[in-house]
Interface confidence: medium
Amino acid sequence: HKCDITLQEIIKTLNSLTEQKTLCTELTVTDIFAASKNTTEKETFCRAATVLRQFYSHHEKDTRCLGATAQQFHRHKQLIRFLKRLDRNLWGLAGLNSCPVKEANQSTLENFLERLKTIMREKYSKCSS
C-alpha cells in the first residue's frame, strides 16, 4: 500500500529539525520511547505529539532559547515552527483526540527527535516496499 503523504511530510520536517542545533535542543522532554512495548503505533504518535506540544508551549517565548543574537532568535523561531508542523502532522497520523504521557524518563529534545525520525523511517520503508 502507498505511504501516507503525511508520513513523508513528517520525515521531511524531522530531517530539517535534526540538521541544526539551537540553544534549546538540549532541554529535556518526556521520553515516551523508553518503555513503549505495549503501546500501539497510533498511541505512540499521539504521545509524541503531546510531548512536542508541551515543549513548544513552554519554550516558544523562552528568552534563554531565543538567545541574544538575531541568528539565535530566528533559529529558535524556525525550531518552533517545525515543531508545530510536526505536532499537527502527528495528530493527523494518530487519529486520536488525547493520550496520557506519564513516563518519568527524560531525554533531550535532540535525542527525542532522532528517535522519532528512526521510527518514522522504519515505518516508511515498510509501507514503500
Epitope: 538575531a70 541568528q71 530566528h74 524556525q78
Partner: nanobody, 116 residues
Framework: EVQLLESGGGLVQPGGSLRLSCAAS????????MAWVRQAPGKGLEWVSW????????YYADSVKGRFTISRDNSKNTLYLQMNSLRAEDTAVYYC?????????WGQGTLVTVSS
Amino acid sequence: EVQLLESGGGLVQPGGSLRLSCAASGFTFRNYGMAWVRQAPGKGLEWVSWIDASGTETYYADSVKGRFTISRDNSKNTLYLQMNSLRAEDTAVYYCAKSAGRFDYWGQGTLVTVSS
C-alpha cells in the same frame, strides 16, 4: 527597493524615555514581521524586540522586558519602539529590520545615548 528609515534617537538621562520610529517602503509592510536590533559601542548585534505581521504577537529580550514596547501601524508602514526607564547600558545604535526567516534588510540606524 527596500528602505527602512529610523528616527527618534538622541541623548536622554537615565530613567528617561524615547520613542523610535521606522518608516518602511519598497515592500508590503503588513506581510512581514519586523524587529528592533541594537549594537552597543564595541559590542555585537543584539536583537531587542520582534513583532509579527499583524502586530498581535511580540517578543522581547530579557534586558528590555517590561521597559520597552514594540508596536506597528500597518496603515502608515511604520514600526515603533517605546523605550522607558532607560539605562546607561541601553546606549547603542538602534536598527529596524525586516524579518523574513532572518533579518534581511536593515535601516541605517539611530543613535540612542543614555547619560547624565
